[in-house]
Interface confidence: low
């Protein structure tokens, strides 16, 4: 008798298959978020109708930081637990006593590097078929670290400034909120804020912009703050000096013109009076007192400490000439000053913006209120300047001496050494 295959055989096989236990891993919540350092529980449960004698569970992770390198987290096989990758040693375990149908695990002291996709793979022979893998995403969150606050740009009135705020750490990426710590907690009306970048741009800052500003960095699990003190700077006296100097310079130019006319007038009048007198040499003088020691060194212009610190530059031997004329008044203001005799005046250019210059190859540093005085001797015996052992001695001269301030053209015409005259403000700072 030949055996004949029943047409019901496939159905019988199916029914037998149905009798065999079918393992099924339950749906997981999809993803879990946990703050760094806190424990995480990764769920995985399954159903089976077979005994748990041959239960085999492997937890694997595909780290977000290295998706090409899956790692074993923990293993249960043959009734024993085995650790996975070394970085999980001592931090991972099953939440319940094994064997069990709840094969969830905990991870203690979670680290940023634990972020990734975790898979539990469950086998429980003789179970066959069904879904034997559960997948859970783990994201380790990091609160914002203390942010850094800083100011970019000039804090002068009318300037634009940017307040910057950034945290080195924070997952998810923090947002940044700036506020002014006054009664309103509102930023100035000219401020625009970028909460993603952590910047506030304040345009055209005024005194009202001054004050304490706070940046709050925040994300899903925490906040952190930093403070910044914005002090808007008012115009400096230095700037006021420049404005005053500009006005003064205008006045000075007018006075200078008058002085030139007067100077020319006196010059020509005296010249016409004494035509018969022979011409005598001219000296370039400085209306300053002699220093205690005047050594003749290689050409060097010094800043002396007399009232008006006049400066005279001569040629290579640093000879100095001093005016003994008591009629030359020491005046540090930006005005022309006339002597009581009407025959002597000194002029000080107050705020001309003259840079340091080079004369005779030497760098001249501008001094304080330099005055150039040309003295024309009218007596028959001019003062004799003698120089011995490097010092300059002075011999008396007749009393008939007139001091004039002469124009540059006139100086050149009479053969005087041309000198640029640097000037400074009264306080001694350059202008």
């Amino acid at each position: 008798m030949t055996s004949q295959r029943s047409p019901l055989a496939p159905l019988l096989l199916l029914s037998l298959h149905g009798v065999a236990a079918s393992l099924e891993v339950s749906e997981s919540p999809g993803s879990i978020q946990v703050a760094r350092g806190q424990p995480a529980v990764l769920p995985c449960t399954f159903t089976t109708s077979a005994a748990l004698i041959n239960l085999n569970v492997i937890w694997m992770v595909t780290p977000l930081s290295n998706a090409n390198q899956p790692e074993q987290v923990i293993l249960y096989q043959g009734g024993q637990m085995f650790d996975g990758a070394p970085r999980f040693h001592g931090r991972v375990g099953f939440t319940g006593t094994m064997p069990a149908t709840n094969v969830s695990i905990f991870i203690n002291n979670t680290q940023l590097s634990d972020t990734g996709t975790y898979q539990c793979l469950v086998n429980n022979l003789p179970d066959i078929g069904g879904r034997n893998i559960g997948v859970t995403g783990l994201t380790v969150l990091v609160p914002p670290s203390a942010p850094h606050c800083q100011i970019q740009g000039s804090q002068d009135i009318g300037s634009d400034v940017i307040l910057l705020c950034s945290s080195e750490e924070g997952i998810p990426r923090p947002t940044y909120l700036w506020e002014k710590l006054d009664n309103t907690l509102k930023l100035p009306p000219t401020a625009t804020q970028d909460q993603v970048q952590g910047t506030v741009t304040i345009r055209n800052i005024s005194a009202l912009s001054s004050g304490l500003y706070q940046c709050v960095a925040s994300n899903a699990i925490g906040t952190s703050t930093c403070l910044l003190d914005l002090q808007v700077i008012s115009p400096q006296p230095r700037n006021i000096g420049l404005i005053a100097g500009a006005i003064g310079t205008g006045a000075v130019i007018i006075i200078f013109c008058i002085a030139l006319i007067l100077g020319a007038f006196f010059y020509w009048r005296s010249k016409n009076k004494e035509e018969e007198e022979e011409e005598i040499p001219n000296e370039i003088r400085e209306d300053d007192l002699p220093p205690k020691c005047s050594s003749a060194k290689a050409f060097h212009t010094e800043i002396s400490s007399s009232d008006n610190n006049t400066l005279t530059s001569s040629n290579a031997y640093n000879s100095r000439y001093w005016s003994n004329n008591p009629k030359v008044h020491r005046n540090t203001e930006s005005v022309s000053h006339f002597s009581d005799l009407g025959q002597s005046f000194s002029f000080h250019s107050g705020n001309a913006n003259i840079p340091s210059i080079y004369a005779n190859g030497t760098h001249l540093v501008p001094g304080q209120h330099k005055t150039l005085v040309v003295t024309a001797n009218r007596g028959s015996s001019p003062q004799v300047m003698s120089r011995s052992n490097g010092s300059v001695s002075r011999k008396p001269r007749p009393p008939h001496t007139h001091s004039y301030t002469i124009s540059h053209a006139t100086l050149e015409r009479i053969g005087a050494v041309p000198v640029m005259v640097p000037a400074q403000s009264r306080a001694g700072s350059l202008v």
Epitope: Q69, E71, Q72, L75, Q77, Q80, F82, D83, G84, A85, P86, R87, F88, H89, G90, R91, G93, N108, N109, Q111, S113
Partner: antibody, heavy 119, light 111 residues
Framework: QVQLVQSGAEVKKPGASVKVSCKAS????????ISWVRQAPGQGLEWMGW????????NYAQKLQGRVTMTTDTSTSTAYMELRSLRSDDTAVYYC????????????WGQGTLVTVSS | QSALTQPASVSGSPGQSITISCTGT?????????VSWYQQHPGKAPKLMIY???NRPSGVSDRFSGSKSANTASLTISELQAEDEAVYYC???????????FGGGTQLTVL
């Protein structure tokens, strides 16, 4: 600086037990694990097992399972390795080594303890 | 699982470079970036020279470098010096229940 100082040499009879200590200093003991590695005379290195000083979890090499026990005393920052039922082929220098739990290498080693099993 | 495979010995002259190989499987060397190298002088404890395949601990000369290709890791020592003469061991993390495998060791001789 990190130091692991082990107990002195031991001579044991077959069947006896030995307990070797490893005192750690210069770092936070509970932040690392301790591994034990042995080296028979003229032979290579053999990993014996690992203990977490953080929570006392252990993993032992399969061939030593049941004969070895590793423990720690966090109050003294000391790790211990006990090997029972000694045999002559257990004669070796036993080293403790610090294990950063996140990388798997043995970054600092003790000076070694010679255990001689002889009848 | 058996030990990782290393050559029993290598040699080189001072100033030369040498390379020591360490061959495993995809379950150990090839599967993880947890390969370390140790130097052991006679009568001394081993010293970590390279960890995680390529990283050098502080205090170790930059003449020592590590690399990995597939299931084989390598230690290269450049500009050999007399004090480099020692036995070198590799080890690798491997999945449980073995966890740690050592190579058999390579004796480096500086000629």
């Amino acid at each position: 600086q990190v130091q692991l100082v082990q107990s002195g040499a031991e001579v044991k009879k077959p069947g006896a037990s030995v307990k070797v200590s490893c005192k750690a200093s210069g770092y936070t003991f509970t932040s690392y694990g301790i591994s034990w590695v042995r080296q028979a005379p003229g032979q290579g290195l053999e990993w014996m097992g690992w203990i977490s000083a953080y929570n006392g979890n252990t993993n032992y090499a399969q061939k030593l399972q049941g004969r070895v026990t590793m423990t720690t005393d966090t109050s003294t920052s000391t790790a211990y390795m006990e090997l029972r039922s000694l045999r002559s082929d257990d004669t070796a220098v036993y080293y403790c080594a610090r294990v950063p739990a996140w990388s798997g290498q043995f970054d600092y080693w003790g000076q070694g303890t010679l255990v001689t099993v002889s009848s | 699982q058996s030990a990782l495979t290393q050559p029993a010995s290598v040699s080189g002259s001072p100033g030369q470079s040498i390379t020591i190989s360490c061959t495993g499987t995809s379950s150990d060397v090839g599967g993880y970036n947890y390969v370390s190298w140790y130097q052991q002088h006679p009568g001394k404890a081993p010293k970590l020279m390279i960890y995680e395949v390529t990283n050098r601990p502080s205090g170790v000369s930059d003449r020592f470098s590590g690399s990995k290709s597939a299931n084989t890791a390598s230690l290269t020592i450049s500009e050999l010096q007399a004090e480099d003469e020692a036995v070198y061991y590799c080890n690798s993390y491997t999945s449980g229940p073995t966890y740690v495998l050592f190579g058999g060791g390579t004796q480096l001789t500086v000629l």
